[in-house]
Structures are given as structure tokens and as C-alpha cells.
């Protein structure tokens, strides 16, 4: 038995930020779950992970350098991605896993969301020269 996931087919990140909502056919209340967002057709990059536990507040991690946050609904997790680069335009897949207690449960692979990062090109800020000597 697999969980079904719904996500928008396309989102545009105008200011290098976007909210991606993952809606599940499963109530996460009172479950220990792991919601994650994966980049690329092969889902090779785990962008962001949200750990949920009925007795603790959400824990959000990215081990791949993304600036992300997460918000929990009864049957959804919304990922808020910031500081996206134009070259991070790609397809992103929601994944949900009920980790404990067993049996493990996860989702049918969704159709994904194409995130088109449009806005400003994020560049490292220029190094300002120090005060010039007289």
C-alpha cells in the first residue's frame, strides 16, 4: 500500500525563493515520518529533509547546501526554498516515508514539480577594497 503525493506541475521562483507544497493521501498526525525533497529526474540530490514526530517540533536539514525550511499540515508538508540559483531550475520530487513504527511506508513516485528559478542571478558579493593609503 503506497501513499499518493500531489504537487504543482510547475512553480516559478521570482526572487530566488519558492514554496513547494507536497500533499499526501495519508494523515501524518501521530506518526514518525521523514519528508524529503529530491532534485533531478533521477532524484539524485536530496535537497531538504523534514523529520516529524508527534512529541517534538519539526526538524529540518539540508546536507546538500540548500537553504530550506519546512511547515507541517495534517496531510501535507510545505518546503520553503530560498537563495535558489538560476541553474537550479529543475524537476523536484516530494517523498514521504513513515519510518516508525514498522512496517515502513512510502509514496508512489509523483509527477514532480518543475521549479523555474527566474529572478535575480545570485552572485557572491564583491570584495570591497580596504581604505587606500595616502
Amino acid at each position: 500500500n503506497k501513499i499518493l503525493v500531489k504537487q504543482s506541475p510547475m512553480l516559478v521562483a521570482y526572487d530566488n525563493a519558492v514554496n513547494l507544497s507536497c500533499k499526501y493521501s495519508y494523515n501524518l498526525f501521530s506518526r514518525e515520518f521523514r519528508a524529503s525533497l529530491h532534485k533531478g529526474l533521477d532524484s539524485a540530490v536530496e535537497v531538504c529533509v523534514v523529520y516529524g514526530n508527534y512529541s517534538q517540533q519539526l526538524q529540518v536539514y539540508s546536507k546538500t547546501g540548500f537553504n530550506c525550511d519546512g511547515k507541517l499540515g495534517n496531510e501535507s508538508v510545505t518546503f520553503y526554498l530560498q537563495n535558489l540559483y538560476v541553474n537550479q531550475t529543475d524537476i523536484y520530487f516530494c517523498k514521504i516515508e513513515v519510518m516508525y513504527p514498522p512496517p515502513y511506508l512510502d509514496n508512489e513516485k509523483s509527477n514532480g514539480t518543475i521549479i523555474h528559478v527566474k529572478g535575480k542571478h545570485l552572485c557572491p558579493s564583491p570584495l570591497f577594497p580596504g581604505p587606500s593609503k595616502p
Epitope: 536530496e46 529533509v49 523529520y51 526538524q59 536539514y61 546536507k63 516515508e97
Partner: nanobody, 116 residues
Framework: EVQLLESGGGLVQPGGSLRLSCAAS????????MAWVRQAPGKGLEWVSV????????YYADSVKGRFTISRDNSKNTLYLQMNSLRAEDTAVYYC?????????WGQGTLVTVSS
């Protein structure tokens, strides 16, 4: 070829400690959640503990909570189970296994006997 090789079992007195290891090979260990499962003599399989792929989240059966600690070293492709305050009812064959995901691989197990 996927292999999971457990070690570290043995005979220990009640209240003692053991550390089990599971060496993984043949797959990208860091991408998979892992678990320890045990089977006591004449009984069914019991999930003991689960750790997620990043090693950031752990889960324990009530029977071992506060006594056992699961961990992993993705750079060494190794899963661990630190078992403290062992009891006679912890006597079992302990297996490491991939948890969830696309395939279901188990090791051959290591026997832990808790007896005075």
C-alpha cells in the same frame, strides 16, 4: 553483489554491554535507511532500531529504548548497535537489514547470548 556482514555478538552477563557492527558492500550505503532486527529462540522477528540514511534520525522499539543506541558511519559503510544494560530477554540472533527502499537485503546474523 550486495553483502551485509554482522559481527560483535557473543556471551555476556546480565547488565553487560556489547557493540555489534554490520559491514555493508555492493550498494550505495549512504542512500539507504538501515535497521537492526532480532529473532529470539523460538520466536518471530522483532524490529529493534532504525536509522535514516543521513544518520540524523533514530527509532527504537520500546523494549530497548534507553539501553541501545544505533549509529552509522557512511564513510566506512558500517552500521552499529551499542547495547548496554543487557537482559536475558535480549538473547537473540541480531540481523542488520536495509529498511524500506527498493530491495530487501539481510545479513546472516550474529548471536547474542545474555546469561550468568
Amino acid at each position: 553483489e550486495v553483502q551485509l556482514l554482522e559481527s560483535g555478538g557473543g556471551l555476556v552477563q546480565p547488565g553487560g554491554s556489547l557493540r555489534l557492527s554490520c559491514a555493508a558492500s555492493g550498494f550505495t550505503f549512504s542512500r539507504y535507511h538501515m535497521a537492526w532486527v532480532r529473532q529470539a529462540p523460538g520466536k518471530g522477528l522483532e524490529w529493534v532500531s532504525v536509522i535514516d540514511s543521513l544518520g540524523l534520525q533514530t527509532y527504537y522499539a520500546d523494549s530497548v529504548k534507553g539501553r541501545f543506541t544505533i549509529s552509522r558511519d557512511n564513510s566506512k559503510n558500517t552500521l552499529y548497535l551499542q547495547m548496554n544494560s543487557l537482559r536475558a530477554e535480549d538473547t537473540a540472533v541480531y540481523y542488520c537489514a536495509e529498511y524500506g527502499g527498493a530491495f530487501d537485503y539481510w545479513g546472516q546474523g550474529t548471536l547474542v547470548t545474555v546469561s550468568s
